[in-house]
């Protein structure tokens, strides 16, 4: 027998789905509307039949009372070709929701986006999070989104992404985004980050995370930064191959004032780069391959730094040379 | 809403918006006020998830919080002018990116800065 | 925004203008604030609320904007507010007073 596709726990809280079959039986979802937490996944399936069965263009107002019943808060749904009128059929019924956290992933948005909606309201969401999914739409999906989702998003987190560079001219500026999260775009760069960091659309941010998203210098990336005018307090480099030298030709970037948080670990460093703030709360320099403790004079005035797993901290290691075993780090690295 | 009605000059404003028939995780509220015979002027908001914006003219004195449970919106806006005189609107915001507007308000809670 | 003020009578058709600083993209709201209480007329330059009657409208781009009402009732006698909505701080104009002649 197949096991089912659906499980809710015994809280109620949480309700996962697998829809592995071809011809998955989709009222199977139904068994999740008293949880808070649902997941469903599509086992890659093209969604386009379901258009023939259901009527994206339809006035959403007719479902808001279900909707408005329903406990989720936080909705991830996973890999599918989703027609991009299905996507916003969803979202437009969504609205009506207590939703407040939405992740996609592994997702294949195919066909264009329809026009602006006549109703002016939106998905409240706090958090949008999308993960390897694509767009037929290019650069201009970002802007698109948008058109269905209320201004007060906080959290929006972008990995994985096929374009991730956006066409800023679209792009309505996100007022309320304290926490911007580009990692795991190895291929976006400095300059990249240039071309997602659209100017004046991010105003509020707070937090900015680019781990291994293919950055080379603290400078760099303060660069793109000042550029783009964006402020963070915390800004998460880790997980990038960092030189530690600048380009002597580059000019030198003042950081903001407002950065007080940078976490350069697991970034390959030999020595303490050059152009780092002068003044930090929190410096994370662990878990890379400093050979020798870094000299005050090249540190930032620092509250609270680390230093963990780097070679001069463990007994009888000496800096790791290409191909040599010895990785120089200690275990938790 | 409800506030004070009269305040000495130096002293803070605490209003509080009540609202019924929607739920805060849903709506953003705006606080607008208007001078006497004057025009309007946007304060700040306090958005679906919590965050706040505020008019950069008031961000050192201005301070939106709510309660979502008790479907209250409070304002607090301290060292109080004259100036600061006038009728203070709680606004609903709705739309999404493009379509945003204020589409209900409050019926005003009238302010008067005097020693 | 212009005029501050404007005498017309019943049946008429007026038109109040507002004038950006710069392109705002059509993030252009209208108002009406009849005494006390205020509520939205248009959204999106030229987008209805509901409930509102058919003899408002709005049109422009760019940097200018208006709002047009075409067959005057009592109930209209109100000023009028618009406001931009393409950045924060959001701001209004400086309203026009319609009065009844």
């Known amino acids: 027998t197949t096991p089912e596709p659906c499980e809710l726990d015994d809280e109620d809280f949480r309700c996962v789905c697998n829809f592995s079959e071809p011809q998955p039986d989709w009222s199977e979802a139904f068994q999740c509307v008293s949880a808070v937490e649902v997941e469903i996944h599509a086992g890659g399936l093209n969604l386009e039949p379901f258009l023939k069965r259901v009527d994206a263009d339809a006035d959403p107002r007719q479902y808001a009372d279900t909707v408005k019943a329903l406990r989720v808060r936080r909705l991830t749904v996973g890999a599918a070709q989703v027609p991009a009128q299905l996507l916003v059929g969803a979202l437009r019924v969504l609205a009506y929701s207590r939703l407040k956290e939405l992740t996609l992933e592994d997702l294949k948005i195919t066909g264009t986006m329809p026009p602006l909606p006549l109703e002016a309201t939106g998905l409240a969401l706090s958090s949008l999070r999308l993960r390897n999914v694509s767009w037929a739409t290019g650069r201009s999906w970002l802007a698109e989104l948008q058109q269905w989702l209320k201004p007060g998003l906080k959290v929006l987190s972008i990995a994985q992404a096929h374009s991730p560079a956006f066409s800023c001219e679209q792009v309505r500026a996100f007022p309320a985004l304290t926490s911007l999260d580009l990692s795991d775009n190895p291929g976006l760069g400095e300059r990249g980050l240039m071309a997602a960091l659209c100017p004046h659309k991010f105003p509020a941010i707070q937090n900015l995370a680019l781990r291994n998203t293919g950055m080379e210098t603290p400078t760099g990336v303060c660069a793109a930064l000042a550029a783009a005018g964006v402020q963070p307090h915390s800004l998460d480099l880790s997980h990038n191959s960092l030189r530690a030298t600048v380009n002597p030709s580059a000019p030198r970037c003042m950081w903001s004032s407002a950065l007080n948080s940078l976490n350069l670990s697991f970034a390959g460093l030999e020595q303490v780069p050059k152009g780092l703030p002068a003044k930090l709360r929190v410096l994370d320099l662990s878990c890379n391959r400093l050979n020798r403790a870094p000299q005050p004079d090249e540190l930032p005035e620092v509250d609270n730094l680390t230093l963990d797993g780097n070679p001069f901290l463990v007994p009888g290691t000496a800096l790791p040379h290409e191909g040599s075993m010895n990785s120089g780090v200690v275990p938790a690295c | 809403e409800s506030g004070p009605g009269l305040v000495a000059p130096s002293q803070s404003l605490s209003i509080t918006c009540t609202v019924s028939?929607?739920?805060?995780?849903?709506?953003?509220i705006s606080w607008i006020r208007q001078p006497p015979g004057k025009g309007l002027e946007w304060l700040g908001v306090?958005?679906?998830?919590?965050?706040?914006n505020y008019n950069s003219a008031f961000m050192s004195r201005l301070s939106i919080t709510k309660d979502n449970s008790e479907s209250q919106v409070f304002l607090k806006m301290n060292g109080l002018q004259t100036d600061d005189t006038g009728i203070y609107y709680c606004v609903r915001g709705d739309g999404n990116f493009y379509l945003y507007n204020f589409d209900y308000w409050g019926q005003g809670t009238t302010l008067t800065v005097s020693s | 925004q212009t005029p501050s003020s404007l005498s017309a009578s019943l049946g008429d058709r007026v038109t109040i203008s507002c004038r950006a600083s710069q392109d705002i993209k059509n993030y252009l709201n209208w108002y009406q604030q009849p005494g006390g209480t205020v509520k939205v007329l248009i959204y999106y330059t030229s987008r209805l609320h509901s409930g509102v009657p058919s003899r408002f409208s709005g049109s422009g781009s760019g940097t200018d904007y208006s709002l047009t009402i075409s067959n005057l009732e009592q109930e209209d006698f109100a000023t009028y507010f618009c406001q931009r909505g393409d950045t924060l701080p959001w701001t209004f104009g400086g309203g026009t007073k319609l009065e009844i002649k």
């Open positions: 028939g929607f739920s805060l995780t849903n709506y953003d």
């Open positions: 306090i958005w679906t998830s919590g965050g706040t």
